[in-house]
Amino acid sequence: ARNGDHCPLGPGRCCRLHTVRASLEDLGWADWVLSPREVQVTMCIGACPSQFRAANMHAQIKTSLHRLKPDTVPAPCCVPASYNPMVLIQKTDTGVSLQTYDDLLAKDCHCI
Amino acid sequence: ARNGDHCPLGPGRCCRLHTVRASLEDLGWADWVLSPREVQVTMCIGACPSQFRAANMHAQIKTSLHRLKPDTVPAPCCVPASYNPMVLIQKTDTGVSLQTYDDLLAKDCHCI
């Protein structure tokens, strides 16, 4: 069950999709990717306060146990719930190929 | 791609499965769960250093960008890669029923 979307920490502070611009050099891809030269990387960043976008029962348990044992159990973490595909044009031994990656760009986020 | 399983931080410090014993009271379930009285909660805890158990391309990107922009991009996070099912015997409006939860106990872990 996807729980509350209201962030008690203030606007934009809780787990949500962010876009980070990165060059091929930033990503360590310059030697094998031809295009694009720059990637708008969508990723999940932000805090996961109690029951905010809890992905599932496990996330709810984690919240409860983190409250009781913060030194032992970490708070839930903001991670992708799904991904958008992206195409990279890459160098291969035989030339150039177009490859689709299904797990590269976050589409939306939840806490787990 | 599941990347390296060698933890550079020392044994047991990196992302792995831990078991935390929790009572119904700990979990906030005492008013709706009859059995079990105590749950051995398996969860994913530990650090995610560079490429350790990287779940996918997104995790690899996150590692690269965290190295470049640690204040903006968090390190990958240790989360369940899969779950073990578990049953709870619970109270409902119509009586007692046994319900299977597929997303309650972590089975194994990765970094994302």
Epitope: - | S35, N84, M86, L88, I89, T100, L105
Partner: antibody, heavy 119, light 111 residues
């Protein structure tokens, strides 16, 4: 939906070993909290609990029959088996398998298989 | 072993009238975890048993509310507020706190 189906030899001779199989569907034998018990009922008599196997392969037996009983499971086949050695006429009964949760909660039962021990 | 003793063994009841079955355990069936694992089953003629009551007093989903369970320690009771024709069969108490055992059964029949 959840189903359990017992199968057995029907007729045995005294001193033989009874082998029973319970094939389950609609749930997994590795689900935490679930297990399967064998329970028997001689004609016109009450229920007698025999053995239980938990999701984690932990086993429990009726102490009065423990030396003759062996319970096991094959999760890949969704089957739970029971062996009862050195049978006598007193082991003639309908044998049921039942799904259990934690310390009881037998919410689904098979229809039972009749076993007769006779020379 | 824990012995579960039911009474009466035979219970003739008039339709619409209440019925009560007692179950006594030879020792306390409060588990070390605090649970009292006492259950009631009904076996209708020609059928497999069916679970009615879980942990002394918790009616299973779908079980009519004319069935109720009570008790603690070693003494437990199943009550039917108004017996209906479909309630005919043998009622068993069961304990799962120690080595699992059933009571010897109480046969409910219509007068």
């Amino acid at each position: 939906q959840v189903q359990l189906q017992e199968s057995g030899p029907g007729l045995l001779k005294p001193s033989q070993t009874l082998s029973l199989t319970c094939t389950v569907s609609g749930f997994s034998l590795i689900t935490s909290g679930l297990g399967v018990s064998w329970i028997r009922q001689p004609a016109g008599k009450g229920l007698e609990w025999l053995a239980h196997i938990y999701w984690d392969d932990d086993k429990r037996y009726n102490p009065s029959l423990k030396s003759r009983l062996t319970i096991s499971k094959d999760t890949s086949k969704n089957q739970v088996s029971l062996k009862l050695s050195s049978v006598t006429a007193a082991d003639t009964a309908v044998y049921y398998c039942a799904r259990g949760g934690y310390d009881g909660y037998y919410d689904y039962w098979g229809q039972g298989t009749t076993v007769t021990v006779s020379s | 072993d824990v012995v579960m003793t039911q009474s009466p063994l035979s219970l003739p009841v008039t339709l619409g009238q209440p019925a009560s079955i007692s179950c006594r355990s030879s020792q306390s069936i409060v588990h070390s975890n605090g649970n009292t694992n006492l259950e009631w089953y009904l076996q209708k003629p020609g059928q497999s048993p069916q679970l009615l009551i879980y942990k002394v007093s918790n009616r299973l989903s779908g079980v009519p509310d004319r069935f109720s369970g009570s008790g603690s320690g070693t003494d437990f009771t199943l009550k039917i507020s108004r017996v209906e024709a479909e309630d005919v069969g043998v009622y068993y108490c069961f304990q799962g706190s120690h080595v699992r055992t059933f009571g010897q059964g109480t046969k409910l029949e219509i007068k």
